[in-house]
C-alpha cells in the first residue's frame, strides 16, 4: 500500500520527466532561488505545448524505459500480508454518496489538471483544497444541499438493499451481529471516507493514464 517502502516507485510520464529536467536546469541556474510553484508549472506547461514531437521524443523514451522498469519491478514485488485481501464489494450495492467537497472537486479537477498538466495528484488535491477553503460558507451551500440529497437517497437505497438481503459472499464480510448499532454506523462513516478517497485516487490515476496516452 501507500506505506510500503519496498513497493516499486510509480512510473513517470514523459511530461513528468520534462518537468523534472526543467527543475534541475532551474536549480543549476538559480541554486539559491526559491521556486514559485504555480508560476514554474505554468512556464513548463507552456514550453511543453510549443515543443516539437522530435524534442518530446527524448522524454517519451525516458517514460517508456521507466514503464518497463516499473513493470519489471512489479513482477517480483510481493505486497505485505493482508494488503491483497480486499473487502468483498457487491457491485449491486448502492454507491456511497459523495461529500460536498468531493462534489466540488469533481467540478473543478478537470480545469486544474487541464491548466497545469504537470501537477501531481497531491498538488491537484492541494489546489482544490485551497479553492474550497477560499469559498465562503454561503457558497458551499449548493454543494452541501446536493450532498445531503444524495446521502438521503443513499440511505433509502441501502435500507431497501439490506431488506432484500445481501448475497452470501458478501455476508461473510458482514460485521458480527452482536456489535452495537452505533459502532456499526461509525465504521460505515469511516468506510464512506475511505471509499471516497479511494475513488478519487482511482479517478486521478485513470485521468493520468489518459494524459499519458495523448
Amino acid at each position: 500500500g501507500k506505506g510500503d517502502p519496498k513497493k516499486p516507485r510509480g512510473k513517470m510520464s514523459s511530461y513528468a520527466f520534462f518537468v523534472q529536467t526543467c527543475r534541475e536546469e532551474h536549480k543549476k541556474k538559480h541554486p539559491d532561488a526559491s521556486v514559485n510553484f504555480s508560476e514554474f508549472s505554468k512556464k513548463c506547461s507552456e514550453r511543453w505545448k510549443t515543443m516539437s514531437a522530435k524534442e518530446k521524443g527524448k522524454f517519451e523514451d525516458m517514460a517508456k524505459a521507466d514503464k518497463a522498469r516499473y513493470e519489471r519491478e512489479m513482477k517480483t514485488y510481493i505486497p505485505p500480508k493482508g494488503e491483497t485481501k480486499k473487502k468483498f464489494k457487491d457491485p449491486n450495492a448502492p454507491k456511497r454518496p459523495p461529500s460536498a467537497f468531493f462534489l466540488f472537486c469533481s467540478e473543478y479537477r478537470p480545469k486544474i489538471k487541464g491548466e497545469h498538466p504537470g501537477l501531481s495528484i497531491g498538488d491537484v488535491a492541494k489546489k482544490l483544497g485551497e479553492m474550497w477553503n477560499n469559498t465562503a460558507a454561503d457558497d458551499k451551500q449548493p454543494y452541501e444541499k446536493k450532498a445531503a440529497k444524495l446521502k438521503e437517497k443513499y440511505e433509502k437505497d441501502i435500507a431497501a438493499y439490506r431488506a432484500k438481503g445481501k448475497p452470501d459472499a458478501a455476508k461473510k464480510g458482514v460485521v458480527k451481529a452482536e456489535k452495537s448499532k452505533k459502532k456499526k454506523e461509525e465504521e460505515e462513516d469511516e468506510e464512506d471516507e475511505e471509499d471516497e478517497e479511494e475513488e478519487e485516487d482511482e479517478e486521478d490515476e485513470e485521468e493520468e493514464e489518459d494524459d499519458d496516452d495523448e
Epitope: L103, S106, E107, Y108, P110, K111, G114, M131, N134, T135, A136, D138, D139, Q141, P142, Y143, K146
Partner: antibody
C-alpha cells in the same frame, strides 16, 4: 479568442416564455462556471443565475426563482436560460458571462440579447 | 445582503486629468473579493480590476484599484478619450454577487 454569443431575445407578453442561448467558443467550456446577468434599460447590473461546469448545481436570484431555469450542454458549448411566467420587470438586456468557480469576477461577457415583456 | 454604493453618481472631467471613483460596502468584503468593470453605451461590461487591485489581462496600467474592507477606489491616472463610460464595482466574496449602481464618467 474567447467569444460568447447570446440569442433568443425578443418581445413577449406578460406570462409568456422565452429561451435564451449563449454559444461559447475559444475556450474549454466544460471547465467553467457560467452566469446570466441582466441590465434593465438605463439601470445597473443584476445577477440572474449561475451553473457549475457539469450543470449539476445551479443557483438563482430571488427575483427569478421558480420561474427561470439555467442549463448547459457541454457537447454543444452552449448555455441556456429558460424563462417562464415573464413579467414586465424582467425586461432587460441579458448577458451570459464566464466565471471561475463560485462567485467570481466575470472575465468574459457576451454582447447581450434584449428581452422585452410587454402587452 | 451586502449593499454596494458608488460615488459620485456622475464625474465630469477632461482628458489628461486623474479620475478617482469610490465604492463603499455596507459590510466588509470577504478577502477583498472586489472587481471593477467598464461599460460603454451599447456594449457589454469589461473586467478591469479583480481582487481589489489586480489588473485583468490587456488592461492599460493607467487603471489601478486599491482599498480593503469596506472602502475601495478605482483610479485612472490620465484620462484618455476612450475612458469615458460607466464604471461598476462588484463584490464576489459572498452570495449573492452584488454590483454597485455605477458611476458615469463624462467629458467636461
Amino acid at each position: 479568442e474567447v467569444q460568447l454569443l447570446e440569442s433568443g431575445g425578443g418581445l413577449v407578453q406578460p406570462g409568456g416564455s422565452l429561451r435564451l442561448s449563449c454559444a461559447a467558443s475559444g475556450f474549454t467550456f466544460s471547465w467553467y462556471d457560467m452566469w446570466w446577468v441582466r441590465q434593465a434599460p438605463g439601470k445597473g447590473l443584476e445577477w440572474v443565475s449561475w451553473i457549475v461546469p457539469s450543470g449539476g448545481i445551479t443557483a438563482y436570484a430571488d427575483s427569478v426563482k421558480g420561474r427561470f431555469t439555467i442549463s448547459r450542454d457541454n457537447s454543444k458549448n452552449t448555455l441556456y436560460l429558460q424563462m417562464n411566467s415573464l413579467r414586465a420587470e424582467d425586461t432587460a438586456t441579458y448577458y451570459c458571462a464566464r466565471g471561475n468557480y463560485g462567485p467570481s469576477p466575470f472575465d468574459y461577457w457576451g454582447q447581450g440579447t434584449l428581452v422585452t415583456v410587454s402587452s | 445582503d451586502i449593499q454596494m454604493t458608488q460615488s459620485p453618481g456622475t464625474l465630469s472631467l477632461s482628458p489628461g486629468e486623474r479620475a478617482t471613483l469610490s465604492c463603499r460596502a455596507t459590510q466588509s468584503v470577504r478577502k477583498n473579493f472586489l472587481a471593477w468593470y467598464q461599460q460603454k453605451p451599447g456594449q457589454a461590461p469589461r473586467l478591469l480590476i479583480y481582487d481589489a487591485s489586480s489588473r485583468a489581462t490587456g488592461i492599460p496600467d493607467r487603471f489601478s484599484g486599491s482599498g480593503s474592507g469596506t472602502d475601495f477606489t478605482l483610479t485612472i491616472s490620465r484620462l484618455e478619450p476612450e475612458d469615458f463610460a460607466v464604471y461598476y464595482c462588484q463584490q464576489y466574496g459572498n452570495s449573492p454577487i452584488i454590483f454597485g449602481q455605477g458611476t458615469r464618467l463624462e467629458i467636461k
